[in-house]
Structures are given as structure tokens and as C-alpha cells.
Amino acid sequence: LEASEEVELEPCLAPSLEQQEQELTVALGQPVRLCCGRAERGGHWYKEGSRLAPAGRVRGWRGRLEIASFLPEDAGRYLCLARGSMIVLQNLTLITGDSLTSSNDDEDPKSHRDLSNRHSYPQQAPYWTHPQRMEKKLHAVPAGNTVKFRCPAAGNPTPTIRWLKDGQAFHGENRIGGIRLRHQHWSLVMESVVPSDRGTYTCLVENAVGSIRYNYLLDVLERSPHRPILQAGLPANTTAVVGSDVELLCKVYSDAQPHIQWLKHIVINGSSFGADGFPYVQVLKTADINSSEVEVLYLRNVSAEDAGEYTCLAGNSIGLSYQSAWLTVLPEEDPTWTAAAPEAASHHHHHH
């Protein structure tokens, strides 16, 4: 074999409807290019159940499987699945042959292949078709929400899927509202979850050849009524130079719909507080949590007058929470001068 020669399935067109089961022997160091479907509708290539990325030394790209230089770890089972389905278009095993340096130059490269189109589909143990969609293993959802677990798989014969909860068969008969099992989507759906739905959910995918399983852990958060929670340390004390831009950040967590305001503390008639004991404030920004970037207060081209105390105030039907920070503004001409913020620079308070 010449070093430049590639192992290639010709032509690079859509395969016949019958699945191609093939075994190819590839010399170490040899480039490989295998095709599956027309370029614009090419299938997705998987190695041992993991989808190949479109970039890298071994890549699946526009229906092509490309290996720059075949290495021992590249040997194994490769599958091409039709886009948008789990139909196996190509099913082949790459086997490591001799390295190019020791290969027999008289050998016909085609003798490395078994391209017979078998009419009987080969049996295959179940495997995950989209493991990247199963990456989120730990789920925590508020009570009343809908939960959907998916375990997309394939195999031959087509596997069956069943679900366990905490190791026991789970059909949802004891669950108010039951469950929805969508076998064609390999999914379990539970609507309006409650604390008793907490547990370990296992999908068990089986066929005559083998079985695989995957666990999801579910926690259900009880909607205990509470005022908004503000992330500690935000907004943060900030120092800026005259003319610069400043961003103050406030992170709000709330089950009930929260309402957020940004306030600046001001002085009226020489006093910071009114007769009622509350501070004088100016409302700079107000909105609900769904508004774009309401949790950020932008101050453009700051001047000395912008220095002072700023408060993020969040309220819901249960109560109010607020945290404050100080903005210190330094003059451009004398960067050595610093305005000292009060000792207790960052406050956080809760009001019922």
C-alpha cells in the first residue's frame, strides 16, 4: 500500500436501503475516508456510541468519516446513522493491519475489505445514540414543574426501554397524574412533580444481545414561600475614575415573581434620612425579573456626583430583600486620592 492511498468506500453517495455491514483492515498510518450519504444530507458517524466531532484527527463531517492517519486506538465499531432518525446506514468495524512500513507492496488493497452486502442484519447490543444529551445527570426542579428524562438508544434488534425508580419497576401507577412513556422518543415525562417524586430514575435499554442503563437523580424543590434571595457579595463595592463606565450587578433568586429596583441614596437638606427613619433614595431603574438585564445597573461616563451608596431592592409577594454597595469615584488628575467608603461597606437586609 502506498502511504498516500486512502481506504474509501466508493461511490460517496447514499447507500442502498440495506444496511452495509463491513469489516475493513486498515494499515497503521494510512489515511481513511469513508462516506455515508450525500454530502448535504450525510449521516452522522459514531464510534462506540459516541458521535464524532466535525473537527480533529478523527472526524465525522458532512457524511464523511475521516481519519488523518490510522492509529491502533482508531480500531473499533463505527456506525453511520441517518440524520433525524436512528436508522443505521453504515455499520463497519475497522481492524488494525500491519503498519505501512512493513506492508506487502504486492497486496491488493481491496483484499482488505469485506464489502458483501448482507441481507440478514447483524445483531448489535444497545448503545446510546446521543450521549451528549444525557450529560445532565442531576436534576433539581421546583414542585409543579414538568420533568423529562431521555435515553435515546439504538441496537439490533431494536431495543426496548423500561424505567425504574430507586431500583424498582416504575409505571407511575401510584403517582398522581401518572407518567407519560414515549418509547419512540426513549423518554419518561412527569408533570407537576411533587417531593415524593424525588429519587433515582433508571432507564434500562435491552435487546437479545445485551443491555445498558443510565441513572438520573431528581430532587424536587418545595415552593416554600420566601422573599427573594440575593447572591452574597453583590452588588460589590466599586472604585472608578471620572469619565469611565461602571456596572453594578445584582443576582436575584425567587420562586414568586420578583420585582427589582435600583436605588441611589441621596441627601436632602443635609440629611440622608427622612422623619420616618428611612433613607432618602432616588429610583434609577425598575422592572420585573424577566426584563432584559434588569439585574445590571449601568452607569456611563461617571462623575464625582455619581459617587455614593447604591441599593438593589428585590421584592415579591412574601417580602423584600436588599443589598447595597458603595461607588467611589476618583478624579482623573489625582489617582492617588481615594475616597474612603464607610466601614460597613456592603450591607444586606431582609424585610417582611
Epitope: A140, G199, T200, R213, Y214, V220, Q231, A232
Partner: antibody, heavy 119, light 112 residues
Framework: EVQLLESGGGLVQPGGSLRLSCAAS????????MAWVRQAPGKGLEWVSV????????VYADSVKGRFTISRDNSKNTLYLQMNSLRAEDTAVYYC????????????WGQGTLVTVSS | QSVLTQPPSASGTPGQGVTISCSGS????????VNWYQQLPGAAPKLLIY???LRPSGVPARFSGSKSGTSASLAISGLRSEDEADYYC????????????FGGGTKLTVLG
């Protein structure tokens, strides 16, 4: 800045009990899964237990099941590990770790607290 | 006996590259992503690689991870003396219970 600070370790006799604490700061504790991982002297890491944000969902390693209890107090931003019926093989540095909510790895670890079980 | 198998030791000289392997089974690495942790002498473990091949911010590009089937590997290029540490692979395991399994750890020595 995310910080996890374990405490409560010490010397205890076989059969005794100990309660470890992990004070969390710099993140919204009540929204994260948390875990305990231990490391016996000169040995590798061993996962001990995991707990959901509500505190109502817990999982344990077989080696501690029935003896250890993981819990949390979200109002105090604190994770706990109650260890009962302690054995010599429980001697280890115990780390608390935050679990990343996206891909379920331990993204932040505490500095650890040493538990020694010996008579 | 760790569920994931790692070589107990590895070594290299400064500037060299080294690869640490981690072998598992279909119930752990085969079904779940692999994470790598670095433990410097006397310190707590620190996340090095997550989701097979992703680096947290602050981890140099010299560290890279990969996974194929039921095995994973951590590659370190351009070795530096500060890379001398224990390295652990980990993954969730979907056996009869859900739990996390670790490799036994690989002690990396940077020679000279």
C-alpha cells in the same frame, strides 16, 4: 469567590460518632447539589455521599450506607455529614465539594478535615 | 481496588509530554463523561478537565482530555515542575445505584 470550609474532624474511638460541617460562601448554596468525598492516608479519592438542593434527595456509597447521614441547612449555607458506628477504615481526610449543575462534576472542593478512628 | 484503572505512576522531563490512561466499563465511562482532578502535594483536589475534554478557566491548554468507548486519557504537553502531582479520573457509574467512581490515581513525577 466560591469557598468551602470543612470542620468537625478529630480523633474518635471505633463505634463512636462525629459530625462534620462544611460552610459554603460565594455562591447560592440552596441551588446546588453537594457531595462528600474522602481520602484515606496515602490512598486515592473515594466518593461518600451526595445531596440535592432541597436536602430531600440523598445517595450514599455502599461502604457508608446506614451509618452516615448527609444533610444541609440552606438558611445557614452549611452542609453536614453525621458519621455513626465509625470504623478504623473510615479514617480519612473528608472533603466537601460542590457539584456543577450542568455536567455533574465536582467543580469546587474544600480544604478537607481529618477524621481519625482509633482506640 | 478502584473501579477505574489508572497506572500508579508516570514520569517525564520538563518540556516533554505525558499521557495518563483511565480504563473503565460500559456502566461508567461508557455511559458518562469523564472528569480529571489534580491534587498537588498536601492540597485538596482541583478540577482539571470536565466532560471528557473541557478545561475550566485558569487551566492551561497544555492539559487536554479525551475519551473513546470505555477508556479515557489525560495528556499533558510541555511538562513543568509544578505539574508534579497526583491525577485522578472520575465518572458517574450507572450500576444498581447511582454513584461516583474514581481511578486509583497516577503520581506524576517531573524528573530533573
Amino acid at each position: 469567590e466560591v469557598q468551602l470550609l470543612e470542620s468537625g474532624g478529630g480523633l474518635v474511638q471505633p463505634g463512636g460518632s462525629l459530625r462534620l460541617s462544611c460552610a459554603a460562601s460565594g455562591f447560592t448554596f440552596s441551588t446546588y447539589w453537594m457531595a462528600w468525598v474522602r481520602q484515606a492516608p496515602g490512598k486515592g479519592l473515594e466518593w461518600v455521599s451526595v445531596i440535592g438542593p432541597s436536602g430531600g434527595m440523598t445517595v450514599y456509597a455502599d461502604s457508608v450506607k446506614g451509618r452516615f447521614t448527609i444533610s444541609r441547612d440552606n438558611s445557614k449555607n452549611t452542609l453536614y455529614l453525621q458519621m455513626n458506628s465509625l470504623r478504623a477504615e473510615d479514617t480519612a481526610v473528608y472533603y466537601c465539594a460542590r457539584i456543577n449543575s450542568g455536567s455533574s462534576h465536582f467543580d469546587y472542593w474544600g480544604q478537607g478535615t481529618l477524621v481519625t478512628v482509633s482506640s | 481496588q478502584s473501579v477505574l484503572t489508572q497506572p500508579p505512576s508516570a514520569s517525564g522531563t520538563p518540556g516533554q509530554g505525558v499521557t495518563i490512561s483511565c480504563s473503565g466499563s460500559s456502566s461508567n465511562i461508557g455511559s458518562n463523561s469523564v472528569n480529571w482532578y489534580q491534587q498537588l502535594p498536601g492540597a485538596a483536589p482541583k478540577l482539571l478537565i470536565y466532560s471528557n475534554n473541557l478545561r475550566p478557566s485558569g487551566v492551561p491548554a497544555r492539559f487536554s482530555g479525551s475519551k473513546s468507548g470505555t477508556s479515557a486519557s489525560l495528556a499533558i504537553s510541555g511538562l513543568r515542575s509544578e505539574d508534579e502531582a497526583d491525577y485522578y479520573c472520575a465518572a458517574w457509574d450507572d450500576g444498581l445505584d447511582a454513584y461516583v467512581v474514581f481511578g486509583g490515581g497516577t503520581k506524576l513525577t517531573v524528573l530533573g
